[in-house]
């Protein structure tokens, strides 16, 4: 990752990609450390921003602007030598956030997916965006960049994620962009969190007072492993909601969650999966389905969930 | 259909104001960012800049900053230019002109609007 | 700023003949992102301009397949192949890879 001989390396931490008012850490390392370092702005000349400073270890940049955006790169400090500097280090781009209305990201088939499938998030916008760009949370590395394809008067563009491994599963964002100002990225799409299953070993789920009941008689569903899983989910087929609940170990020595589904008036299919802390976006596989009847007068459907959605919230902690 | 309509000719004098208005519809206003092009009496055209409208930022180029003005109102689709302290050199026909954000800049032009600087 | 040099300044045709625009940009217009925002605009009599050709060689939307767009880094050609009556304006080339955006001066295209 470090520079040639005699360039320097630029990197932006927390990532390249700031909402506008953010900060960002632009950093330069150059020969095993972070010396001096001078900063450049390629948008009309190669001569230094911030009028010639010089920086130690990194410099903070912001709270930025659209002005903010655009190409950077470094100097490192090199006394002995004929200019006192290095040669020009890789280029580093900053895209800052928020210039234009959010577009929209979905995922194919759907956000819950195998070790080892492909799935398909597509990005797109009647802002009739030329780029989209495609982030995870917590990453530094540049986004992805696909060019939009106009149909039916929307833009969109296909990022294809796969074959999934954990290090895939998290929360992604789309962003689009403008010719006029192709770093200056739009507000952020809604969050949508890609899930991982079938890397540890299924739970059971059962139902309490039993998978057939009568309408209006209050159902428990419980989840439990060996497995020292730190939260629960519950899914139901058909359902774009899961419920997730923290595990909570037993005298018996497994981890179980129980899910008050409270008066029964649908029957359903449900399935529930195991994760741990450190990476909440990566399942157990998942439990043998269990269905549960209800008999009756059923209604149309169950209470509506009160546990977040799965739509976004489910790659962070459960505090 | 897409349409810009601007307001209509203005006579004024060296020193005085001027509010030129660009009326969008046929399109969701704020999708679209928009920008200003003069053009002088038998001359060529010269990009003075554009507004965001989804956030209201202006970017204008060097030679028109200071006198110049970009605005919009969202509610009623518009964008305005607005020139002060008028000089003989700001008479000349001014276009708005959207975005096209797909890969090319002014895929819709408003007709112009004649500006006469005479004292 | 990057100026946009257009030749010839006019260019007699006659119906039915090629026409060849020529731009010159006095830097490489190459934005960072990979893309060359090089556009084409004619302006009719007495009109606004229109597009007519983006990013080098895409034509616009009901843009006839006449026109064409060809060249890179800073040199430019617009080509219409048979010219009809309905083409006689000013050529303006455009360079939106590089704030302040510029227009090249023109070329008026008029009949023999």
């Known amino acids: 990752l470090m520079g040639g001989q005699d360039k320097p390396f630029l990197s932006a931490r927390p990532s390249t990609v700031v909402p506008r008012g953010g900060h960002v850490a632009l950093q330069c390392h150059y020969r095993r450390g972070f010396n001096n370092f001078m900063l450049y702005k390629e948008d009309r000349s190669h001569v230094p921003i911030f009028h010639g400073r010089i920086f130690q270890e990194s410099f903070i940049m912001g709270p930025v602007t659209p002005a903010h955006a655009g190409t950077y790169r470094c100097r490192g400090s090199r006394p002995h030598s004929l200019t006192g500097w290095s040669a020009p280090s890789n280029p580093l781009v900053i895209m800052v956030t928020g210039n234009h209305r959010k577009p929209s990201l979905l995922a194919h088939p759907g956000p819950l997916l195998k070790s080892g499938e492909t799935v398909i998030l597509q990005c797109w916008s009647d802002v009739m965006f030329e780029h989209f760009f495609l982030h995870r949370e917590g990453i530094s590395e540049d986004p992805s960049r696909l060019v939009g394809q106009i149909h039916d008067g929307v833009s969109k563009a296909n990022f294809s994620i796969g074959p999934l491994m954990p290090v895939l599963a998290g929360t992604y964002r789309c962003y689009g962009s403008v010719p006029h100002s192709p770093y200056q990225l739009s507000a952020p799409s809604d969050p949508l969190d890609i899930v991982i299953t079938g890397l540890y070993e299924k739970p059971s789920l059962s139902a309490q007072p039993g998978p057939t009941v009568q309408a209006g008689e209050n159902v428990t569903l419980s989840c439990s492993s060996w497995s020292s899983y730190d939260i629960y989910h519950l899914s139901r087929e058909g359902e774009a909601h899961e419920r997730r609940l923290r595990a909570v170990p037993k005298v018996n020595r497994t981890f179980q969650a129980d899910f008050p589904l409270g008066p029964a008036t649908h029957g359903g299919t449900y399935r529930c999966f195991g994760s741990f802390r450190a990476l909440p976006c990566v399942w157990s596989n998942s439990s043998d389905p269990l269905l549960v009847s209800v008999t009756g007068n059923p209604s149309s459907s169950w209470p509506s969930p009160t546990e977040p959605s799965s739509k976004s919230g489910i790659c962070r902690h459960l505090h | 259909q897409i349409q810009l309509v601007q307001s209509g000719p203005e006579l004024k004098k060296p020193g005085e104001t001027v509010k030129i208005s660009c009326k969008a519809s046929?399109?969701?206003?704020?999708?679209?960012?928009m920008n200003w092009v003069k053009q002088a009496p038998g001359k060529g055209l010269k990009w003075m800049g554009w507004i965001n409208t989804y956030t209201g930022e202006p970017t204008y180029a060097d030679d028109f900053k200071g006198r110049f003005a970009f605005s919009l109102e969202t509610s009623a689709s518009t964008a305005y230019l607005q020139i002060n302290n008028l000089k003989n050199e700001d008479m000349a026909t001014y276009f708005c002109a959207r975005n096209g954000n797909f890969g090319y800049y002014f895929d819709y032009w408003g007709q112009g609007t004649t500006l006469t600087v005479s004292s | 700023d990057v100026l946009m040099t257009q030749t010839p300044l006019s260019l007699p045709v006659s119906l039915g003949d090629q026409a060849s625009f020529s731009c010159r940009s006095s830097q490489n217009i190459v934005h960072s992102n990979g893309n060359t925002y090089l556009e084409w605009y004619l302006q009719k009599p007495g009109q606004s301009p229109s597009l007519l050709i983006y990013?080098?060689?895409n034509r616009f939307s009901g843009v006839p397949d006449r026109f064409s767009g060809s060249g890179s880094g800073t040199d430019f050609t617009l080509k219409i192949t048979r010219v009809e009556a309905e083409d006689l304006g000013v050529y303006y080339c455009?360079?939106?890879?590089?704030?302040?955006?510029?227009f090249g001066s023109g070329t008026k295209l008029e009949i023999k």
């Open positions: 990013k080098v060689s």
């Open positions: 046929g399109y969701t206003f704020t999708n679209f960012g």
């Open positions: 455009f360079q939106g890879s590089h704030v302040p955006f510029t």
